[in-house]
Amino acid sequence: MMTGTIETTGNISAEKGGSIILQCHLSSTTAQVTQVNWEQQDQLLAICNADLGWHISPSFKDRVAPGPGLGLTLQSLTVNDTGEYFCIYHTYPDGTYTGRIFLEVLESSVAEHGARFQIP
């Protein structure tokens, strides 16, 4: 039975040209996290493997950086970066947990962070 929940940074906004940290946290389970995948729609951005460390997809290498922790930092944001991002936690023995973050990249200087929310 999967008892865990993923807490994410929720719906967030950031300015064009700036940077943003995407963060998820898996709680309420004793399952061992073996790998975390970060995806944008159907594109793989990065993988953090418990044994092998980080792998950043070559097409994002100049704009994506690992951390803090299991989070992901996106730099030099463009309006095309607006959309859904997913953190996919591979765990043993529970299986897979997925968290969703929606990022809106704004032209203006009015960019505010949304509240955290939980996904069961």
Epitope: E7, I21, Q23, H25, S27, T30, V33, V36, C48, N49, A50, L52, G53, W54, H55, I56, K61, D62, A65, P66, G67, P68, G69, L70, T73, Q75
Partner: antibody
């Protein structure tokens, strides 16, 4: 087995700069963040910042933004930290530490920096 | 920045005694890491993600907590456990450490 070898102790003049190294072995250098941590008897452990050698990205504690500069040489699997405009407050032991998402799992032995006036 | 307050600052325990030390955060954090450091040596990752024991850490250690309150518990003190233990958070930039709890053998 990962291993981090730091450069030797430094005795430096106030106002000068110092550059210390952290040579990594036993793992893929470009797949892990390299953190730097300052330890003093009074302040305990303080996080300075980290560099991701895979693309050179750096993330600094604002307190050390104008004090420390982090770099990495992937050809030699070595991370560096330069500390500028040294004062007595910079006298400390500085550690490098590897981190791949699950806290800092391997630490160097530390580099002691003593600033003399 | 988030301030981590560890208590007690210093404590002593007899062999076999149960030990609990706490780490209180000035704002809510999602998880806590703990490091063990013995005099003259580097810190070692001890407990990560609040409750997971690092490789080689004896099962007599455990970690728990949520929000602003976290703890490290040692079910039965042994001589080799005498050390300073630091908590660390990275739910918020910059990462911060507590000032440490020094655990001595009585």
């Amino acid at each position: 087995q990962a291993y981090l070898q730091q450069s030797g102790a430094e005795l430096v003049r106030s106002g000068a700069s110092v550059k210390m190294s952290c040579k990594a072995s036993g793992y893929t250098f470009t797949s892990y963040n390299m953190h730097w941590v300052k330890q003093t008897p009074g302040q305990g452990l303080e996080w300075i910042g980290y560099i991701y050698p895979g693309n050179g990205y750096t993330n600094y504690n604002q307190k050390f933004k104008d004090k420390a500069t982090l770099t990495a040489d992937t050809s030699s699997s070595t991370a560096y930290m330069q500390i500028s405009s040294l004062t007595s407050e910079d006298s400390a032991v500085y550690f490098c530490a590897r981190e791949g998402g699950w806290a800092m799992d391997y630490w160097g032995q530390g580099t002691s920096v003593t600033v003399s006036s | 920045q988030i301030v981590l307050t560890q208590s007690p600052a210093i404590m002593s325990a007899s062999p076999g005694e149960k030990v609990t030390m706490t780490c209180s955060a000035s704002s809510s954090v999602s998880q806590m890491h703990w490091y063990q450091q013995k005099s003259g040596t580097s810190p070692k990752r001890w407990i990560y993600d609040t409750s997971k024991l690092a490789s080689g850490v004896p099962a007599r250690f455990s970690g728990s907590g949520s929000g602003t309150s976290y703890s490290l518990t040692l079910s039965s003190m042994e001589a080799e456990d005498a050390a300073t233990y630091y908590c660390q958070q990275w739910s918020s930039n910059p990462s911060t450490f507590g000032v440490g709890t020094k655990l001595e053998l009585k």
